[in-house]
């Protein structure tokens, strides 16, 4: 057992341009408070567990009123440490979330209004009993400076707070098999204290307060013999006497979850699903009210003024679960339109838009036909972040403003000469060719190959293409 301690040194604008506006004003004075949430492990899986190591809420800071025209300074902080007690071993690696909250003290209907100013998170390695570790984290334009440490509560010692120490019974040495406690050389390592009532014959423990059963025994205190008549859920080795599998000690044996919690095995241990009103690793913390701050990740707690009435957590977008402990992947909804890239920053959703699109969700097609006219009778064709004009005959260019030179593409075949005409172009064909584009050779006998020359038009005469 022990305590994780967090000391906030400062919360204010970070370095660089774009200093944030002060969160408080003369019209709306406010004060800050902080919330810390701890989870065991460095892995991403730790994010799924609801502050399994514990959470704490600071006191409210002094009331602050912005000086008109002044930039946001470092804001006044609450006194004292944030302390998160842990009952079991300190994991050595942990994840943290520190939230900075603003409490507005204006004329609020129904009491003060709370809003989340900043949230920082990180994953760290930390040995219990070590010195204070200093850290700086940035959230948008804000900067949070803080220190933290984990310390064991006597009689626990060690980097994980799992070794127990007792004062020496004799001044010279410790008892048989027990070492001196470093750094407290005047104390001796004590044997592990198992859960009260744990059978000394059939139970054992690897951590204080635990009671794990030897093969053939079950129950919370390992006092119940396992029935050999029905060999359900085989787990352990075969029993020589019955020739049947006897369940060995599984993590959910004897249901470690208190207060009606249901136990489910996980690859490494077990997980308790607690009924409303209870929480903690084993549902051992009871009588939860809104004053205990049971809603994580900025959830708003409603009701639960006394331990008998249930509280309800209203989760902010991006979180769900009875305590707002589960993160929703908002980017899985693909909120960024038109091929935009989604970034879930936790406190906000951001879209990085493709060229040609803008807006919070890339919903604004900058190159569409809206408000864009195609000149000279052209029509606008839009789509996919680009627009183009389909121009009327004789016009070209992006907006159909340029007069097209119909002869630019050299449309007259076989050496025919091209003339621009108000209704298009005219080809004057070289001897031996005819057609609108001089595409047909004239046969020596005067007959043309497909199609026949129009009446009154001799081969070689200019032909107008309409």
């Amino acid at each position: 057992a022990g305590v994780f301690e967090l000391q906030i040194h400062s919360f204010g604008p970070g370095p660089g341009p774009g200093a944030p506006r002060s969160p408080c004003s003369a019209r709306l004075p406010c004060r800050l408070f902080f919330r810390v949430c701890l989870k065991p492990g460095l892995s991403e899986e730790a994010a799924e567990s609801p502050c399994a190591l514990g959470a704490a809420l600071s006191a409210r800071g002094p009331v602050y009123t912005e000086q008109p025209g002044a930039p946001a300074p470092d804001l006044p902080l609450p006194d004292g440490l944030l302390q998160v007690p842990f009952r079991d071993a300190w994991p050595g690696t942990f994840s943290f979330i520190i939230e900075t909250w603003r409490e507005e003290l204006g004329d609020q209907i129904g009491g003060p209004a709370w809003s989340l100013l900043a949230r920082v998170a990180g994953r760290r390695r930390l040995a219990a009993g070590g010195p204070w570790a200093r850290d700086i984290q940035r959230a948008g334009a804000w900067e949070l400076r803080f220190s933290y440490r984990a310390r064991c509560e006597p009689p626990a010692v060690g980097t994980a707070c799992t070794r127990l120490c007792r004062p020496r019974s004799a001044p010279s040495r410790c008892g048989p098999g027990l070492r001196p406690c470093a750094p407290l050389e005047d104390e001796c390592e004590a044997p592990l204290v198992c859960r009260a009532g744990c059978s000394p014959e059939h139970g054992f423990c690897e951590q204080p307060g635990e009671c794990r059963c030897l093969e053939g025994w079950t129950g919370p205190l390992c006092t119940v013999p396992v029935s050999t008549s029905s060999c359900l859920s085989p787990r352990g080795p075969s029993s020589a006497t019955t020739g049947c599998l006897v369940p060995g000690p599984g993590p959910c044996d004897g249901n470690p979850c208190a207060n009606g919690g249901s136990c489910s095995e996980t690859p490494r241990s077990f997980e308790c699903t607690c009924p409303r009103g209870f929480y903690g690793l084993r549902c051992e913390v009871s009588g939860v009210t809104c004053a205990d701050g049971p809603c994580f990740n900025g959830g708003l707690c409603v009701g639960g003024a006394d331990p008998d009435s249930a509280y309800i957590c209203h989760c902010p977008p991006g979180f769900q679960g009875s305590n707002c402990e589960k993160r929703v992947d908002r980017c899985s909804l693909q909120p960024c339109r038109n091929g935009g890239l989604c970034l879930d920053l936790g406190h906000a959703l951001r879209c990085r838009c493709r060229a040609g699109f803008a807006g919070p969700r890339c919903e604004h097609d900058l190159d569409d036909c809206a408000g864009r006219a195609c000149a000279n009778g052209g029509t606008c064709v839009e789509g996919g972040g680009a627009h183009r004009c389909s121009c009327a005959l004789g016009f070209g260019g992006r907006d159909c403003r340029e007069r097209a030179d119909p002869c630019a593409a050299r449309p007259c075949a076989h050496g025919g000469r091209c003339y621009a005409h108000f209704s298009g172009l005219v080809c004057a064909c070289a001897p031996g060719y005819m057609g609108a584009r001089c595409e047909f050779p004239v046969h020596p006998d005067g007959a043309s190959a497909l199609p026949a020359a129009p009446p009154g038009l001799r081969p070689g005469d200019p032909q107008r293409y309409l």
Epitope: P317, G318, P335, R337, N338, R361, E363, H364, D365
Partner: antibody, heavy 121, light 107 residues
Framework: EVQLVESGGGLVQPGGSLRLSCAAS????????IHWVRQAPGKGLEWVAY????????YYADTVKGRFTISRDNAKNSLYLQMNSLRAEDTAVYYC??????????????WGQGTTVTVSS | DIQMTQSPSSLSASVGDRVTITCRAS??????LNWYQQKPGGAVKLLIY???RLHSGVPSRFSGSGSGTDYTLTISSLQPEDFATYYC?????????FGGGTKVEIK
């Protein structure tokens, strides 16, 4: 309970001006974008304008761009639509509607009852 | 602008009938399609958002489906309070546009 109440409608001559208001309650107004949507007599719904929760993003339909101005006062939980150079085709019932949190879907999840604007000489 | 074409423009049905309304967009709207109900008094309610997600408090007899340009609103068993006009709206690209509406009348 989420509530949106529009006001400020009335009869106005072509070329005249009108200012519509929308009073919001039952939710944290400053967390949500708000839309104005209108419905001409016997016709369907037409989106008019949108303003984001902090007022930094503003959009208008082409039919009203340059004539209408959307604004909000988060301290008063109020939304406004300033309508200038009004035309006969602006005659409609005007609704304010709340957008979804985070503008993921660009829905209009709660609507007011509407206020009637008649432009006629 | 993205045009939204709703069909049919009106339909007559009886209580208990299964009713289907379709909405076609002039280009892909990537499921950002919402459905609204408007009662004769003028009140408008969101029924379904993001093609198929039921808004809170909306009965489960309403459902939505579709993708790309084609979307459908289905009322599995029409109730007396469902006689109203239904509109689709795309939330993909500005300006937000509505379909012309489908009036569901009593047969």
């Amino acid at each position: 309970e989420v509530q949106l109440v529009e006001s400020g409608g009335g009869l106005v001559q072509p070329g005249g001006s009108l200012r519509l208001s929308c009073a919001a309650s039952g939710f944290t107004f400053s967390d949500y974008g708000i839309h104005w949507v209108r419905q001409a007599p016997g016709k369907g719904l037409e989106w008019v304008a949108y303003i984001s929760s902090g007022g930094y993003t503003i959009y208008y339909a082409d039919t009203v761009k340059g004539r209408f101005t959307i604004s909000r006062d988060n301290a008063k939980n109020s939304l406004y639509l300033q309508m200038n150079s009004l035309r006969a085709e602006d005659t409609a019932v005007y609704y304010c509607a709340r957008g979804d949190y985070d503008d993921i879907f660009y829905t209009m999840d709660y609507w007011g009852q509407g206020t009637t604007v008649t432009v006629s000489s | 602008d993205i045009q939204m074409t709703q069909s049919p423009s009106s339909l007559s049905a009886s209580v208990g009938d299964r009713v289907t309304i379709t909405c076609r967009a002039s280009r892909d709207i990537t499921k950002f399609l919402n459905w609204y109900q408007q009662k004769p008094g003028g009140a408008v309610k969101l029924l379904i958002y993001y093609t198929s997600r039921l808004h809170s408090g909306v009965p489960s007899r309403f459902s939505g489906s579709g993708s790309g340009t084609d979307y459908t609103l289905t009322i599995s068993s029409l109730q007396p309070e469902d006689f109203a006009t239904y509109y689709c709206q795309q939330g993909n690209t500005l300006p937000w546009t509505f379909g012309g509406g489908t009036k569901v009348e009593i047969k």
